[in-house]
């Protein structure tokens, strides 16, 4: 049941990326939709060895990843604002899940290059537009109605079954032989109770 709802959610959410609308827009596919979420790809040049990459939603820092090296060429990778992220030799991918309308916004990759010098900051970004398809909206509208109708049908079915059972039962009570048998059962029960009391 859970997986069914999840697939429905995936079906409903579709992502459209509008790049080139902002200054320093990414000249690559920045948003990759998969597994019920979005992978936001932040690229950096191959020569960059030490850096801080921040994912900004509007002006707010959502995630960050810092890669530095110590004096013995030992690598340190830190996150102050942790998100599920993936580091490669020329990109950092940040993953956002459980998408809804609130995720629609401008997203920026804010890259601070420490090494090689000089220190440099670059900003690239794009707009992540999340909308629901017409079919989704129709399904969203009809699904509760369908569920309600199903429940009503179930209840009516139960009532009908109960009514039919009662009808069948009452017809058997009106049968003369049936009535005689019923009376006998009651009398026997009464006798046994009296016997119990006497003892």
């Amino acid at each position: 049941m859970k997986s069914g709802l999840w697939y429905f959610f995936l079906f409903c959410l579709r992502i459209k990326v509008l790049t080139g609308e902002i200054n320093g827009s990414a000249n690559y596919e920045m948003f990759i939709f998969h597994n019920g979420g979005v992978q936001i790809l932040c690229k950096y040049p191959d020569i960059v060895q030490q850096f801080k990459m921040q994912l900004l939603k509007g002006g707010q820092i959502l995630c960050d990843l810092t890669k530095t090296k110590g004096s013995g060429n030992t690598v340190s990778i830190k996150s102050l604002k942790f998100c599920h992220s993936q580091l490669s030799n020329n990109s950092v991918s940040f993953f956002l899940y459980n998408l809804d309308h609130s995720h629609a916004n401008y997203y920026f990759c804010n890259l601070s290059i420490f090494d090689p010098p000089p220190f440099k900051v670059t900003l690239t970004g794009g707009y992540l537009h999340i909308y629901e398809s017409q079919l989704c909206c129709q399904l969203k509208f009809w699904l509760p109605i369908g569920c309600a109708a199903f429940v009503v049908v179930c209840i009516l079915g139960c009532i009908l079954i109960c009514w039919l059972t009662k009808k069948k039962y009452s017809s058997s009570v009106h049968d003369p032989n049936g009535e005689y048998m019923f009376m006998r059962a009651v009398n026997t029960a009464k006798k046994s109770r009296l016997t119990d009391v006497t003892l």
Partner: antibody, heavy 117, light 111 residues
């Protein structure tokens, strides 16, 4: 302006302990790896060890062999070097240094540690 | 551990001289496009100061008479026109691996 000021040096007996401190100012201390480098009297420079930005990882020179511990308090912007089981060959001026991504770009004035009975 | 050697161990110079200090590593310090080697100057009674990093890049505020060169295992520091304030000890240092090690130093003295 970046400033590193060491303190805590002095005379200590062999086998004894000493803690050196390094107060940092003029930069975001929690953004940098920090190192200790020492220099014996009339000798060259020798790397002691380092610590990463949040203090979770440390590396030491082979001669340390578990005797020294580097730690940091980012809230106090202070670097520490805890020296245990000191030997006469640990006599040196100890420098606190900032690893500026690709070299030791800032050094303290140094603090002298003398190990003698 | 990578062993760093320097030559000469000391050198007597006069103001205006071109001075060259050599540094050799026991293995290549080249990684990608970068040589993981730095040069430091230490004046008497003072802490060392960074001059050159990545074998040839001058640190901020370092006079342009100081030049670093070399690649792989052989490096040199050149002072194009030696001045009296350049007196002191010069150390090369690698940061290719742990532990980072320093050369034994070269002492520059007045002739």
């Amino acid at each position: 302006e970046v400033q590193l000021v060491e303190s805590g040096g002095g005379l200590v007996k062999p086998g004894g302990s000493l803690t050196l401190s390094c107060a940092a100012s003029g930069f975001t201390f929690s953004d940098y790896w920090m190192d200790w480098v020492r220099q014996g009297p009339g000798k060259g420079l020798e790397w002691v060890g380092n610590i990463d930005e949040d203090g979770s990882t440390t590396y030491y020179a082979p001669f340390v062999k578990g005797r020294f511990t580097i730690s940091r308090d980012n809230a106090k912007k202070t670097l520490y070097l805890q020296m245990n089981s000191v030997k006469s060959e640990d006599t040196a001026t100890y420098y606190c240094t900032r690893w500026g991504r690709y070299a030791f770009d800032s050094w303290g004035q140094g603090t002298l540690v003398t190990v003698s009975s | 551990d990578i062993v760093m050697t320097q030559s000469p161990s000391s050198l007597a110079v006069s103001p205006g001289d071109k001075v060259t200090i050599n540094c050799k590593s026991s293995q290549s310090l080249l990684s990608g496009n970068y040589n993981y080697l730095a040069w430091y100057q230490q004046k008497t009674g003072q802490a060392p100061k960074l001059l050159i990093f990545y074998a040839s890049t001058r640190h901020t505020g370092v006079p342009d008479r100081f030049m670093g060169s070399g690649s792989g295992t052989d490096f040199s520091l050149t002072i194009n026109s030696f001045q009296t304030e350049d007196l002191g000890d010069y150390y090369c240092q690698h940061h290719y691996s742990t532990p980072p090690t320093f050369g034994p130093g070269t002492k520059l003295e007045i002739k």
